[in-house]
Interface confidence: medium
């Protein structure tokens, strides 16, 4: 049940952050800045990953694109390339994971390949919550770098007359929304990754064995028992008895008017 | 990077007129808001006029309405202040300030341009 909840909790928490993702992908506030530091003149620009907008104080809004790809720069093509990528994982460990999670069954699929895919689903998100938290990260720092360097080109600039105009930087809300959401993703695939630890049936556990009447005598074959240790041959809990008997595994392994899709 | 190259100052009477060019170089062109400030000496820079990309919205100082007019030209990536009735207290040096949209980029300048008033 505690595994169960686990890997459901690990899987919304991953929803709402991947979510959270594409969201600050595509929103245009990654960083707000005043352009002309002047009550009357307030002209003010926010940027995101594809366009840029400048409203005015008197509430005029203007949009523009980012058609080219030359002239921008590689540190901002490298946001793009880190926010695609986390996308594009986060949606593939989504997928996977909808088939892992133990109250969905799908045929006859064992615990062994739904612990797989809740791992693999798992490392997905977190290297998706990475990619956010990375391209972010890169984003803001690009955003203060340069602040420091406007502030050095004041007394640089212009035959070393100071520049009275000076663009402030500041960090936008999808800075904001990149970082909860990539912390999120990361949480759950950490919260999958613990899941995938109590589905993975262990080598050690014993196996009930159901016994059936036969016609004919069963001989018992000493270290029937050698799986409970974990040593000997029998580390597979195959079948030790040439008789009808079996493991409670198997006998489950047929479908009947219980089991739900 | 880009490159604003100012021209058209020099001197002038009380009253006459002048156009300021500037015209920006270089990969990234596309700059939403360019502007002309001007300095005079042991004042603080101020800023004259502002356009935006479309040339749909402009800004002019008080001192300077009904006087100056801005345009610019993006398919020569090119804008102008038109100077008429220009007094003394016009006189000062006039800087072409471009202002590129893409994230984290730089404020660009011009050398600048001596506009001199003669009473």
């Known amino acids: 049940m505690a595994v169960t909840a686990c890997q459901g909790l690990g899987f919304v928490v991953s929803l709402i952050g991947i979510a959270g993702i594409i969201a600050a992908t595509c929103m245009d506030q990654w960083s707000t800045q005043d352009l002309y530091n002047n009550p009357v003149t307030a002209v003010f620009n926010y940027q995101g990953l594809w366009r840029s907008c400048v409203r005015e104080s008197s509430g005029f809004t203007e949009c523009r694109g980012y058609f080219t790809l030359l002239g921008l720069p590689a540190m901002l093509q490298a946001v793009r390339a880190l926010m695609i990528v986390g996308i594009v994982l986060g949606a593939i460990g989504l997928l996977v994971s909808i088939f892992a999670l133990k109250c969905i069954r799908i045929g006859s699929m064992e615990d062994s390949a739904k612990a797989n895919m809740t791992l693999t689903s798992g490392i997905m998100f977190i290297v998706s919550g990475l990619c956010a938290i990375a391209g972010v990260s890169v984003f803001a720092n690009m955003l203060v770098t340069n602040f420091w360097m406007s502030t050095a080109n004041m007394y640089t600039g212009m035959g070393g007359m100071v520049q009275t105009v000076q663009t402030r930087y500041t960090f936008g809300a999808a800075l904001f929304v990149g970082w909860v959401a990539g912390g999120l993703t990361l949480i759950g695939g950490v919260m999958m990754c613990i899941a995938c630890r109590g589905l993975a049936p262990e080598e050690t556990n014993y196996k009930a064995v159901s016994y059936h009447a036969s016609g004919h005598s069963v001989a018992y074959k000493p270290g029937g028992f050698k799986a409970s240790t974990g040593f000997g041959s029998n580390t597979k809990n195959k079948k030790i008895y040439d008789g009808g008997a079996r493991t409670e595994d198997e006998v489950q392994s047929y479908p009947s008017k219980h089991d739900y899709v | 990077e880009v490159q604003l190259v100012e021209s058209g100052g020099g001197l002038v009477q009380a009253g006459g007129s002048l156009r300021l060019s500037c015209e920006a170089s270089?990969?990234?062109?596309?700059?939403?808001?360019m502007g002309w400030f001007r300095q005079a000496p042991g004042k603080e820079r101020e800023l004259v006029a502002r356009i935006n990309l479309s040339g749909s919205s402009i800004y002019y100082a008080d001192s300077v309405k009904g006087r100056f007019t801005i345009s610019r030209d993006n398919a020569k990536n090119t804008m102008s202040l038109q100077m008429n009735s220009l007094k003394p207290g016009d006189a000062a040096r006039y800087y072409c300030?471009?202002?590129?949209?893409?994230?984290?980029?730089?404020?660009?300048w011009g050398q600048g341009t001596q506009v001199t008033v003669s009473a």
């Open positions: 270089g990969p990234a062109r596309n700059n939403y808001y």
């Open positions: 300030h471009a202002r590129d949209i893409v994230p984290g980029a730089q404020d660009y």
